[in-house]
């Protein structure tokens, strides 16, 4: 009685169960009553990441530097190449097919979360008592200078974009 289902890592062909090719190898010929499945290793810059009966290996992903991409992890015969973005850039999608420049936080805003290869900068407004006077992808909001601790007084209040201006006590009105 010919089988209707095969074990794991096998496939049904011509009413018989053949072994699948292991990851990193492609199918050359199916097994017969007398021969095993014939598999061949994938070539340079190719891969197959599952037990398979593919007759062609997949091409490794190309990390195109013109799109701001670079290799994060080189592919093997069993794994695809993983791309990431150049410093200062991040992926536009999970597949990381292209990159865009990290956003900078404008004056009055600080960095809440620094960008990574896969996520953009997250900015937050500087609350009262803090400021940022630069456009930056790294700088957090800075606290206003405490004039009191320097034995000075506030001559001009700070804003979300400027620090407090301190002055000597005798300038107090």
């Amino acid at each position: 009685e010919p089988p209707t289902a095969c074990r794991e890592k096998q496939y049904l062909i011509n009413s018989q169960c053949c072994s699948l090719c292991q990851p990193g190898q492609k199918l050359v010929s199916d097994c017969t009553e007398f021969t095993e499945t014939e598999c061949l290793p994938c070539g340079e810059s190719e891969f197959l990441d599952t037990w398979n009966r593919e007759t062609h290996c997949h091409q490794h992903k190309y990390c195109d530097p013109n799109l701001g991409l670079r290799v994060q992890q080189k592919g093997t015969s069993e794994t695809d190449t993983i791309c990431t973005c150049e410093e200062g850039w991040h992926c536009t999608s999970e597949a990381c097919e292209s990159c865009v420049l990290h956003r900078s936080c404008s004056p009055g805003f600080g960095v809440k979360q620094i960008a990574t290869g896969v996520s953009d900068t997250i900015c937050e407004p500087c609350p009262v008592g803090f400021f940022s006077n630069v456009s930056s992808a790294f700088e957090k909001c800075h606290p206003w200078t405490s004039c009191e601790t320097k034995d000075l007084v506030v001559q001009q209040a700070g804003t979300n974009k400027t620090d407090v201006v301190c002055g000597p006590q005798d300038r107090l009105r």
Epitope: P125, G129, F130, K140, E148, V153, V154, A157
Partner: antibody
Framework: QVQLVQSGAEVKKPGSSVKVSCKAT????????IEWIRQAPGQGLEWIGS????????NYNEKFKGKATFTADTSTSTAYMELSSLRSEDTAVYYC???????????????WGQGTLVTVSS | DIQMTQSPSSVSASVGDRVTITCRSS????????????LAWYQQKPGKAPKLLIY???TLESGVPSRFSGSGSGTDFTLTISSLQPEDFATYYC?????????FGQGTKVEIK
């Protein structure tokens, strides 16, 4: 203890001005913000702006720019708010309150004056 | 400007009841650097000045009874009175102090049922 005492109620004609005072005691007046808040009859609270008496630095709610002017006299620990070109819509209780004390962590209003009722009526 | 929205606008309750007032801001009031929420709650009785109850969203002002508590983070905040007392019938306001201009919620009146 901290106390803010405001000037008495005023009745004013439309188009005139009024100056409300707020005398502070019990803390360092020059280094603490004085906040000004208004409450129209039966309405909620609205922030007008603030002044840091020692430096004269001010912050105004855009809505009240040109309407309110803040000054302070550190020799008498008194803050003032002048309201100009009065209209009937300016009828409200005006409060002063203490804001941050220079520590940059006390921006909430922990002490309030008793309020000054300004009535604008012809 | 940051908008503050309170609900409900009024609530009828009896002495001993648990009362919850919510306040929502149009922008997060949580600052990542100090992990503080820039929100205060005030109580106002008729003809009187408001009184500070809670600041930094959950810190009880000195002298305020422990039946008052504040919670929440980011954009959603709650003031809870665990067991309403006769002196608690008043109007309650939330206020942010994140950035100028400071703004208040429209108020919640707690009335006797």
């Amino acid at each position: 203890q901290v106390q803010l005492v405001q000037s008495g109620a005023e009745v004013k004609k439309p188009g005139s001005s009024v100056k409300v005072s707020c005398k502070a005691t019990g803390y360092t007046f020059s280094t603490s913000w004085i906040e000004w808040i208004r409450q129209a009859p039966g309405q909620g609270l609205e922030w007008i702006g603030s002044i840091l008496p020692g430096s004269g630095s001010t912050n105004y709610n855009e809505k009240f720019k040109g309407k309110a002017t803040f000054t302070a006299d550190t020799s008498t620990s008194t803050a003032y708010m002048e309201l100009s070109s009065l209209r009937s819509e300016d009828t409200a209780v005006y409060y002063c309150a203490r804001g941050d004390d220079g520590s940059y962590v006390r921006w909430y209003f922990d002490h309030w004056g008793q309020g000054t009722l300004v009535t604008v009526s012809s | 400007d940051i908008q503050m929205t309170q609900s409900p606008s009024s609530v009828s309750a009896s002495v001993g009841d648990r009362v919850t007032i919510t306040c929502r801001s149009s922008q997060s009031l949580l600052f990542s650097v100090n992990q503080k929420n820039y929100l205060a709650w005030y109580q106002q009785k008729p003809g009187k000045a408001p009184k500070l109850l809670i600041y930094w969203a959950s810190t009880l002002e000195s002298g305020v009874p422990s039946r008052f508590s504040g919670s929440g983070s980011g954009t959603d905040f709650t003031l809870t009175i665990s067991s309403l007392q006769p002196e608690d019938f008043a109007t309650y306001y939330c206020q942010h102090y994140y950035s100028y201009p400071w703004t208040f919620g429209q108020g919640t009146k707690v009335e006797i049922k």
